[in-house]
């Protein structure tokens, strides 16, 4: 006879799994809010700022009724990967003015990376179809000026905050449907 079977594999409780993802997302939302406020204090935004390379908004009040876990997690992961790339770019190419946002920007990058790994784990634990590997994204052009870097920072942090805000609400809603 072969070796005795190992302990029975306990299937994860999807609600508990989602709970911990919500906690991480909320925590990152608070971090992003603080960093965006810090940026506004140091470099007040004159009006709204957009960056064409940022993902388009995925959620709104109207979309909540049709939310499904695989779609939400896949889309959220894709959007957050894009924001991670933008934060990395900002730290590398944002110019000396944005160095005043360190080490907070580095901490945000690390926590964003952690949330992405958490989402990946959640998708595999819930046996959701894994998204195909991300195609290599075209490199982001460096800002044309110091002010261009600051405007990009406003757009990136504002967009990330909005994405995380809706993510918390969407994940909370999905938890009730499990």
């Amino acid at each position: 006879p072969g070796p005795p079977p190992g302990p029975p594999r306990v299937s994860p409780d999807p609600r508990a799994e989602l709970d911990s993802t919500v906690l991480l997302t909320r925590s990152l939302l608070a971090d992003t809010r603080q960093l965006a406020a810090q940026l506004r204090d140091k470099f007040p935004a004159d009006g709204d700022h957009n960056l064409d390379s940022l993902p388009t908004l995925a959620m709104s009040a109207g979309a909540l009724g049709a939310l499904q876990l695989p779609g939400v997690l896949t889309r959220l992961r894709a959007d957050l990967l894009s924001y991670l790339r933008h934060v990395q770019w900002l730290r590398r190419a944002g110019g000396s003015s944005l160095k005043t946002l360190e080490p907070e920007l580095g901490t945000l990058q690390a926590r964003l990376d952690r949330l992405l790994r958490r989402l990946q784990l959640l998708m595999s634990r819930l046996a959701l179809p894994q998204p195909p590997p991300d195609p290599p994204a075209p490199p982001l052009a460096p800002p044309s000026s110091a002010w261009g870097g600051i405007r990009a920072a406003h757009a990136i942090l504002g967009g990330l905050h909005l994405t995380l805000d809706w993510a918390v609400r969407g994940l909370l809603l999905l938890k009730t449907r499990l």
Epitope: D48, G62, L162, D165, V168, L173
Partner: antibody, heavy 117, light 110 residues
């Protein structure tokens, strides 16, 4: 700085109509769901309705369904509330507010609507 | 009659800690985020707490929120005279498909 400025309030007779506007500035208006809320004199807050960032979806409180319509013009950064078949109980200060998720993070200063004969 | 239930009034002396409760049901507080708003006399409401316990920028950490089951509470420590205002809790309601509020609590600083 985020700013929301309501206008269009005033005195109207029962059964009449009124259109409120909310001019937004200081943020990318087309990225945010927008709401109307109201507060009757000396009373609490009441949510009126919400419109999604692109205008494709709208939800209303039961008390105004079929009488009020929310719309928006993203090219003008403006939110609207068309109020028809007004009743005395619609008398209130009307606020527009921005929604980034489940909450209202910025509010306008409000505009007073009085429905009376 | 408000969907969420709050005490109509609360009071405290400067420096004290006060708590305002908000109770609902599984279709609102139980399943959704709770938010709190402060309305100073004669002004528009202002967001005070969101997603149960998060503070927006500019709100002092004397304010805190918590939630358990179908109830939530707002705590204010180190009470100040400028905290005298109306406080409202709010949540999305799945049954009504809309946002619901508590009736508001008038806080008096004695």
């Amino acid at each position: 700085e985020v700013q929301l400025l309501e206008s269009g309030g005033g005195l109207v007779q029962p059964g009449g109509s009124l259109r409120l506007s909310c001019a937004a500035s200081g943020f990318t208006f087309s990225h945010y769901d927008m709401n109307w809320l109201r507060q009757a004199p000396g009373k609490g807050l009441e949510w009126v309705g919400v419109i999604s960032y692109d205008g494709s979806n709208k939800f209303y409180a039961d008390s105004v369904k079929g009488r009020f319509t929310i719309s928006r013009d993203n090219s003008k950064n403006t939110l609207y509330l068309q109020m028809n078949s007004l009743r005395a109980e619609d008398t209130a200060v009307y606020y527009c507010a921005r929604t980034p998720g489940s909450h209202f993070d910025y509010w306008g200063q409000g505009t007073l609507v009085t429905v009376s004969s | 009659q408000s969907v969420l239930t709050q005490p109509p009034s609360a009071s405290g002396t400067p420096g004290q800690r006060v708590t305002i409760s908000c109770s609902g049901s599984s279709s609102n507080i139980g399943n959704n985020a709770v938010n709190w708003y402060q309305q100073l006399p004669g002004t528009a409401p202002k967001l005070l707490i969101y997603y149960d316990d998060l503070l927006p920028s500019g709100v002092p950490d004397r304010f805190s929120g918590s939630k358990s089951g179908t109830s939530a509470s707002l705590a204010i420590s180190g009470l100040r005279s400028e905290d005298e205002a109306d406080y409202y809790c709010s949540a999305w309601d799945d049954s009504l498909n809309g946002v619901v509020f508590g009736g508001g609590t008038k806080l008096t600083v004695l």
